[in-house]
């Protein structure tokens, strides 16, 4: 027999199948050109000394063989004696060490058996009613296919599934979607309605994330406010990355979990924009304001659960940066200006009412005045900070007020509102004899002392009513007692106390009269 033809004789070996586990398998035969055909198969087991024979039986019952030696692939033409227009049955017999091993048979019409391609190019992945839907363009001239998929997770081996018959320019498949683990999918195709025809190769891996992106397990820390009025937000723990199946390791588009940082600036509610989402890789610098920060995990199916943290306001206060002058027309604040064309947000809130919404005002963009100061004024009628109580004032600045991450803290301080001069006057001034020539003066703390940094000092004034001589004694803001010495017995004195702020001289308390009794010696 000629090597290019199928030999219609008995093969040169005994016919018995040894039935061993090794041997030829996965035979597939298909047309590769208008008149050319190919059969290929796998051989399991030691290959030394193995000879392969491709067997073919025609519908008439006549059988022939091709001897391929050690090769597991054979090409032949439609002139090789094998009928290509009618159904034939093919199998492989492999002869080695005086025994024959036989593959499963395939029965097909060779002319119609076209080698199908797997899904090529872009396989679109979407979610449909809790299942995974894959869709792709049908390869050219290959409409009408059976499609299978196989899938695995990081901890499981391949499982086979069926996509059903396809008969359109686009093909699709519904597959199981895992809730919490990533999956790798591959697809293969064969001609519809020809069970004996061979499957295509498996497609490239399609990597699919779990339906639920993982809950981000992270912790934040925030640094001290810098001189520029901003503090760095840092991640103490990175989010854990998803475990991936073998074929999805390395750059596998589609399976990525991305983490976003959602900032919500709670302070300064009158600003243009309160929230901003940004990549977790670009951890922002924040002003000293209070924030809520959420980490949102997302994959190709959308966002997953998030975790939210509260970042409290920076409570560090500036002792003297703010100057407040109260005039007949109203009140003006002055503070060291930032760059030109800066927008300021002035926020105030009565101390002790931190839960309630702060009042705030946004200035128009302003340049520094000749003294390098920025200002904000309001009239008495507006009622702003009009009550006689302690207010916490924070001033924020931004050259881009719509950009949440560019706000910075200019200062944070306290201010006593209303008529601080009168409201701050110390009450309950009392005088007690201390020694033969001294007294102890006590008073109740000024209301100003409830306002951190506002009370600069107390001043105690003592007037000798005989000579009208006056002495004044400064007292630390933390003290509410002073000893007056070098007093003369029998002389009437009046004592008064006032409380001063950095920018305001307080009103004197009601005069308190006293005298030291003359000591009569026995």
């Amino acid at each position: 027999c000629r090597t290019s033809e199928c030999c219609f004789q008995d093969p040169p070996y005994s016919d018995a199948d040894s039935g061993s586990a090794s041997g030829p398998r996965d035979l597939s035969c298909y047309r590769i050109s208008s008149a050319g055909y190919e059969c290929s198969w796998q051989y399991e087991g030691p290959t030394a000394g193995v000879s392969h024979f491709l067997r073919c039986c025609l519908s008439s019952g006549r059988c022939c063989y091709f001897a391929t030696g050690s090769a597991t692939r054979l090409q032949f033409s439609d002139q090789a004696g094998v009928s290509v227009l009618h159904t034939v049955t093919l199998w492989v017999e492999s002869w080695a060490r005086n025994r024959t091993e036989k593959s499963p048979e395939v029965t097909l019409q060779l002319y119609k058996s076209v080698k199908y391609k797997p899904p090529l190019g872009d396989i679109k992945v979407s979610k449909l009613a809790g299942q995974l839907r894959m869709e792709w363009e049908t390869p050219d001239n290959q409409v009408g296919a059976e499609v299978q998929f196989r899938h695995r997770t990081p901890s499981s081996s391949w499982k086979l599934g069926d996509c059903g018959p396809q008969d359109d320019d686009t093909e699709s498949c519904l597959c199981p979607l895992e809730m919490n683990v990533a999956q790798e999918f591959q697809l293969r195709r064969r001609r519809l309605g020809s069970q004996g025809s061979s499957w295509s190769k498996w497609s490239s891996p399609v990597c699919v994330p779990p339906e639920n992106p993982p809950q981000p397990q992270v912790r934040f820390s925030v640094e001290q406010l810098g001189r520029d009025g901003r503090r760095r937000l840092t991640l103490k723990e990175q989010p854990t990355q998803l475990e991936l199946p073998e074929g999805c390791q390395g750059p596998a588009p589609g399976v990525e979990v991305t983490y976003q940082l959602q900032l919500h600036m709670l302070s300064c509610p009158c600003k243009a924009k309160a929230t901003r989402t940004l990549p977790l890789e670009k951890m922002p610098y924040l002003s000293g304001a209070a924030y809520n920060v959420a980490v949102i995990s997302s994959n190709r199916f959308g966002p997953g659960p998030n975790q939210t943290w509260h970042i409290p306001a920076d409570t560090h206060t500036e002792p003297v940066a703010l100057n407040i002058s109260v005039g007949t027309n109203g009140t003006t604040m002055y503070w060291p200006a930032r760059a030109q064309s800066t927008t300021y947000c002035i926020e105030w809130q009565p101390v002790g009412q931190e839960g309630s919404l702060a009042t705030c005002n946004l200035t128009a963009p302003q340049d520094p005045d000749p003294a390098g100061m920025a200002t904000y004024s309001w009239s008495r009628e507006s009622g702003a900070m009009g009550q006689e109580k302690c207010y916490h004032i924070t001033i924020f600045a931004s050259a881009h007020p719509k950009k949440l991450t560019l706000w910075s803290t200019v200062l944070s301080t306290y201010h006593f509102g209303g008529n601080a001069s009168a409201a701050g006057t110390p009450h309950h001034v009392s005088v007690k004899n201390h020694s033969l020539d001294s007294v102890s003066v006590d008073w109740a703390p000024s209301l100003l002392s409830t306002c951190p940094g506002v009370l600069k000092e107390y001043v105690v004034r003592c007037r000798d009513e005989d000579s009208n001589q006056v002495s004044e004694h400064p007292v630390q803001p933390t003290e509410t007692q002073v000893t007056l010495s070098d007093l003369r017995a029998g002389v009437a004195y009046t004592v008064q106390v006032r409380a001063d702020t950095a920018w305001l001289r307080g009103a004197w308390s009601q005069p308190q009269r006293f005298s030291i009794k003359v000591q009569v010696s026995d």
Partner: antibody
């Protein structure tokens, strides 16, 4: 006026080094994140590197990782790009750009780097 | 090969409207803000659109941006000869930890 001015470009042999500078004016440089972006002749924009306002976070494109180093000096209002082991494919116009929340709102006019033997 | 995909060129007559598409993935456009840049011949790029659809001051309202899923679109109405330029989309890619641009689209006003 807000302005960025690049300098330091020139002709260099393959394997050589160059240091690009970008001088910022008209804004508070220390508050802003910055980027370098390049454009090869007749080609599109290619992002090169990012540095945040206080130099605590830095990123590079894979094409320059290990060869280029971004840095800044806020006291001098300056951004830098140290380029080592230069290759023919690094020939481009190099721009520095100010970033505000993921968009580059101010660009310099660029400085030309030519790598050729 | 650019991470973001844009058509190489578009053209239209003066007064007409054009759109330029930019497609990416969930790790870039899908989860981050998109910007658009205009580069007139021989000049540096200029920010045209930020945060998907916001215009910087000085940019006419003939320019608009939108985003849907993993794609973004730049729209230009009332085309003028002065709009002839290269247009680039750009964003951050969270998987690459890198900035990314589209390959650019040359707009020709016929």
């Amino acid at each position: 006026e807000v302005q960025l001015v690049e300098s330091g470009g020139g002709l260099v042999q393959p394997g050589g080094s160059l240091r690009l500078s970008c001088a910022a004016s008209g804004f508070t440089f220390s508050s802003y994140d910055m980027n370098w972006v390049r454009q090869a002749p007749g080609k599109g924009l290619e992002w090169i590197s990012y540095i945040n306002s206080r130099s605590s976070t830095i990123y590079y494109a894979d094409s320059v990782k290990g060869r280029f180093t971004i840095s800044r000096d806020n006291a001098k209002n300056s951004l830098y790009l140290q380029m080592n082991s230069l290759r023919d494919e690094d020939t481009a116009l190099y721009y520095c750009a100010r970033e505000i929340e993921d968009s580059m709102d101010v660009w310099g006019q660029g400085t030309t780097v030519t790598v050729s033997s | 090969q650019s991470v973001l995909t844009q058509p190489p060129s578009v053209s239209a007559a003066p007064g007409q409207k054009v759109t330029i598409s930019c497609s990416g993935s969930s790790s870039n456009i899908g989860n981050n803000y998109v910007s658009w840049y205009q580069q007139l011949p021989g000049t540096a790029p200029k920010l045209l659109i930020y945060d998907n659809n916001e215009r910087p001051s000085g940019i006419p309202d003939r320019f608009s941006g939108s985003k849907s899923g993993t794609s973004a679109t730049l729209g230009i109405t009332g085309l003028q000869p002065g709009d002839e330029a290269d247009y680039y989309c750009g964003t951050w890619d969270s998987s690459l930890s890198a900035g990314v641009f589209g390959g650019g689209t040359k707009l020709t006003v016929l």
